[in-house]
C-alpha cells in the first residue's frame, strides 16, 4: 500500500524520495509521475532528472532538496484539491527490471484559517505548518515566501538544520530510500 502524505490547499506539498548515488558523476535518472508506477517509466511525467540535471519539469513541480546527493523529493507548489492522488517516484537503475518504484499518496485538505504565528525563534514558529512524523505519517510544508520575519541567514540555518536532522531522519524512515552501489 502507498505511503500517505498530506498538505493543505494553497500550501506546498512534499513527497519524499531518496537514493544514494554510487559516484558524483553517476547520478541515476529519476522520474516522477502522477498515478501509480507502471511496469516501465512513469505515467504522466511531471519531472525528470538525468545523469546530472533536472531536465524536464512541468509548472509547480520541482526538487527543493539536493538532488545531486540523492534527495529527489518532489515539491508541488500551491496545491489544489485536484493534486490529490498517487504519485510515482521511480529510480531508474541501469539493468533489466532494476528500477526502484515508490508509490506515494497525496491527500489535500481544505485550507484552515490559522492565527498569525508568534515571533518565537524555534522550528515551530519559523515553519508554523511544517509537520513531520516518524514512519508513514503526514508531511506538510509551506513556501519560504510565507514565513514570518526571519533574516536570510536564519532561514538558511533553520532549513539546513531541519533537513539535516529531524526531517531527513523521519522521511528516510518512511521507506522511500534506496542505496545504489
Amino acid at each position: 500500500s502507498e505511503v500517505e502524505y498530506r498538505a493543505e490547499v494553497g500550501q506546498n506539498a512534499y513527497l519524499p524520495c531518496f537514493y544514494t548515488p554510487a559516484a558524483p558523476g553517476n547520478l541515476v535518472p529519476v522520474c516522477w509521475g502522477k498515478g501509480a508506477c507502471p511496469v516501465f517509466e512513469c505515467g504522466n511525467v511531471v519531472l525528470r532528472t538525468d545523469e546530472r540535471d533536472v531536465n524536464y519539469w512541468t509548472s509547480r513541480y520541482w526538487l527543493n532538496g539536493d538532488f545531486r546527493k540523492g534527495d529527489v523529493s518532489l515539491t508541488i507548489e500551491n496545491v489544489t484539491l485536484a493534486d490529490s492522488g498517487i504519485y510515482c517516484c521511480r529510480i531508474q537503475i541501469p539493468g533489466i527490471m532494476n528500477d526502484e518504484k515508490f508509490n506515494l499518496k497525496l491527500v489535500i485538505k481544505p485550507a484552515k484559517v490559522t492565527p498569525a504565528p508568534t515571533r518565537q525563534r524555534d522550528f515551530t514558529a519559523a515553519f508554523p505548518r511544517m509537520l513531520t512524523t516518524r514512519g508513514h505519517g503526514p508531511a506538510e510544508t509551506q513556501t519560504l515566501g510565507s514565513l514570518p520575519d526571519i533574516n536570510l541567514t536564519q532561514i538558511s540555518t533553520l532549513a539546513n538544520e531541519l533537513r539535516d536532522s529531524r526531517l531527513a531522519n523521519d522521511l528516510r524512515d518512511s521507506g522511500a530510500t534506496i542505496r545504489i552501489g
Epitope: 559516484a23 558524483p24 558523476g25 553517476n26 545523469e51 546530472r52 540535471d53 533536472v54 531536465n55 519539469w57 520541482w62 526538487l63 527543493n64 532538496g65 539536493d66 538532488f67 545531486r68 515539491t75 507548489e77 538558511s156
Partner: antibody, heavy 118, light 107 residues
Framework: QIQLQQSGPELVKPGASVKISCKAS????????INWVKQRPGQGLEWIGW????????KYNEKFKGKSTLTVDTSSSTAYMQLSSLTSEDSAVYFC???????????WGQGTSVTVSS | SIVMTQTPKFLLVSPGDRVTITCRAS??????VAWYQQRPGQSPKLLIY???NRYTGVPDRFTGSRYGTDFSFTISTVQAEDLAVYFC?????????FGGGTKLEIK
Amino acid sequence: QIQLQQSGPELVKPGASVKISCKASGYTFTDYYINWVKQRPGQGLEWIGWIYPGSDNTKYNEKFKGKSTLTVDTSSSTAYMQLSSLTSEDSAVYFCARSGNYYAMDYWGQGTSVTVSS
Amino acid sequence: SIVMTQTPKFLLVSPGDRVTITCRASQSVSNNVAWYQQRPGQSPKLLIYYASNRYTGVPDRFTGSRYGTDFSFTISTVQAEDLAVYFCQQDYSSPYTFGGGTKLEIK
C-alpha cells in the same frame, strides 16, 4: 596543485575551424566534469556545454549545438573543444572549467582568446 | 532556459562598505546557485556554491543566501582587492545560465 592549462590564442579566418585544448593536472581527470564557457569582450558568461571524461557523456547548450564539439583524451588528461564555421560572433575568450563541489565550477583555465578575422 | 536576472549592474563603493548583489531566478532552482568573482584580465573564481556555502579559502566577508527564487551575495566589508565583476550562475538545469554580472568599483 590542481590546474587547467589552456592552449594559446588563435587568429582564424571566417569559415574555418579551430580546436582548443585544456590540460588537467593535480586530480583524477575522469572523476569530474569539464565545462566550456564563452566570454565576449566586456560581456557576460555563456555556458557552452560539458563533457564527463569518465564516460564521454556530453551535454550542450542548444545554442552551441553544431558550433562546438567536445572531446577528451583521458590518456593525456586533456579536454578539447572544436569550433566550426567560425564567424565574427565567435570571437571571444573561451574558458574550460572543472565542476567540483556541488557541481559549481571550482577550477578554471586561464582562457583561450579566439579572434575571427579575414 | 532559466533566466538569472542580476542587479545592480554597477556598484561604486568605498573600502569598508557593505554591499549586496541579488540574482532572481525565473523559476525555482532550489539551492543550485553559485557566485563567481572575475578580476580584470583573470578567469572567474568560485566564491559561493550551493547558494550559501563558502568555497575553500574564500574570506568570510563573502556570504550567500537564498529566499525562494531570490539569491543574495554580500560582501560585509569591501576591500580594495574586491574590485571585480561578480556573476551568479544556476546549475539546476541545463543550459546553465549566468547573471549579467555586477561590476564593483572602488572609490
